[in-house]
């Protein structure tokens, strides 16, 4: 979280910012709240990028005002505008590419005063990891697939029953680079499993961290899985 | 596109005083930090101070506190440095700079400068 | 203040030949955060100064890849892949970590 007070008498309304990560190819979101204003024609929203020379986004008066608007963004900004009264100035990233990420000023002005806060924007992909039993092997084999990935992420596997045992002999993990030539599809195969245990395929790079667990007993099989981004922090 | 226009040369006399402009069109005034530049043959290029459009507040090289006094004019989306007691040692083209990005502890970029004005100090 | 001192002074090259250009500050760079405000300009003749590199190694936008930015803590080196005719003039770096920002004397790049 990051509240822009500010220093030398700069701002004069606070202003907060969370650090997010944007999945490439999908929408993303860049949060900013400040302290509202009672009349949406005083208030003008305007976010700016690092080693950006127009302005990412524009709102003013009431709606967009995207004149000054940097050609790699257009059309694909969009602030939630009736939120904005309520003192929502996030942003909405349409179509996330990887060249979006750095670092974003969120910078407000009402008849209350002035005020900004700067935001760090991670890009890449992450999915969910699906873990299945693999009734091809030879042996009792497990298999965890995620489909869009990058950076390129680490693979670990764990077991309920042997916590802390070191499944890298056992297993296997390869990387596929999928059609865009960016992200990459992760396959992970671990080999020798026992039955009536939970194992967890556990994939992480620096922008989010994603599990997926299997519980095989004799009469059926139990998933579940979860995704955390790593780098939400306010500002 | 982003555009800083200054004002004209300027030939004054020893002692006197001189006020320049640099005026910001193409990007909202208030949002961007406006920084000075002296440049010269001998000394190349040396930072005068900043002004923060958004409230006025000043940052002054201590060696140009007392010499240079900034200013801005938000209606007319333009900033002024005012040079006081001039010498030689004053003549020097002046740049106006748009700070692109700055957090709370320092202004990041010039990524916007001006045409420059040139101040040539002479009796 | 912070001394900024850029080597060399002068750059003969020919078109298409790879250029390197040194700066050094007379202390760190590194902000307490972690970031390093080393950036590099290019002063054409005749005109004002322009951006090229933000931070040590980001080009700003519009630059063309054969500029790239590398260094820390208080050594940085700016290079250009290919020279070509549109890149001759002066190149300055600059540093804004410390107060008063202060400038590197310049090199002038021109044709052998």
């Known amino acids: 979280l990051i509240i822009g007070f500010g220093i030398s008498g700069r701002h004069s309304i606070t202003v907060t910012t969370v650090a997010s990560a944007g999945n490439i190819g999908e929408d993303g979101i860049l949060s900013c709240t400040f302290e509202p204003d009672i009349k949406l024609s005083d208030i003008v929203i305007q976010w700016l990028k690092e080693g950006v020379l127009g302005l990412v986004h524009e709102f003013k008066e009431g709606k967009d005002e995207l004149s000054e608007q940097d050609e790699m963004f257009r059309g694909r900004t969009a602030v939630f505008a009736d939120q904005v009264i309520v003192g929502n100035a996030s942003l909405r990233l349409k179509n996330v590419q990887l060249t979006d990420a750095g670092t974003y000023k969120c910078y407000i002005i009402t008849s209350k005063g002035k005020g900004n806060a700067n935001l760090e924007y991670k890009t890449g992909a992450f999915s969910m990891p699906e873990v299945n039993v693999d009734y091809n092997a030879s042996s009792e084999t497990l298999r965890c697939e995620a489909p869009r990935w990058f950076p390129q992420p680490t693979v670990v596997w764990a077991s309920q029953v042997d916590q802390g045992a070191n499944f890298s002999e056992v297993s296997n993990t390869s990387f596929e680079l999928n059609s865009e030539n960016v992200t990459m599809k992760v396959v992970s195969v671990l080999y020798n499993v026992t039955i009536n245990n939970t194992y967890s395929c556990m994939i992480e790079n620096d922008i989010a961290k994603a599990t997926g667990d299997i519980k095989v007993t004799e009469s059926e099989i139990k998933r579940r899985s979860h995704l955390q981004l790593l780098n939400s922090k306010a500002s | 596109q982003a555009y800083l226009q200054q004002s004209g040369a300027e030939l004054v006399r020893p002692g006197a005083s001189v006020k320049m402009s640099c005026k910001a069109s193409?990007?909202?005034?208030?949002?961007?930090?406006m920084h000075w530049v002296k440049q010269t043959p001998r000394q190349g290029l040396e930072w005068i101070g900043a002004i923060y459009p958004a409230n006025g507040d000043t940052s002054y090289n201590q060696k140009f506190k007392g010499k240079a006094t900034l200013t801005v004019d938000e209606s007319s989306s333009t900033a002024y440095m005012q040079l006081s007691s001039l010498t030689s040692e004053d003549s020097a083209v002046y740049l106006c700079?748009?700070?692109?990005?700055?957090?709370?502890?320092?202004?990041?970029?010039?990524?916007?400068w001006g045409t420059g004005t040139t101040v040539t100090v002479s009796s | 203040d912070v001394v900024m001192t850029q080597t060399p002074l002068s750059l003969p090259v020919s078109l298409g030949d790879q250029a390197s250009i040194s700066c050094r500050s007379s202390q760190s760079l590194v902000y307490s955060n972690g970031n390093t405000h080393l950036h590099w300009y290019l002063q054409k003749p005749g005109q004002s100064p322009k951006l090229l590199i933000y931070k040590v190694s980001n080009r700003f936008s519009g630059v063309p890849d054969r500029f790239s930015g590398s260094g820390s803590g208080t050594d940085f080196t700016l290079k250009i892949s290919r020279v070509e005719a549109e890149d001759l003039g002066v190149y300055f770096c600059?540093?804004?970590?410390?107060?008063?920002?202060?400038f590197g004397g310049g090199t002038k790049l021109e044709i052998k």
């Open positions: 700079a748009r700070c692109g990005f700055y957090d709370d502890y320092y202004d990041w970029y010039f990524d916007v």
């Open positions: 193409g990007h909202t005034f208030t949002t961007y930090n």
């Open positions: 600059c540093q804004s970590t410390h107060v008063p920002y202060t």
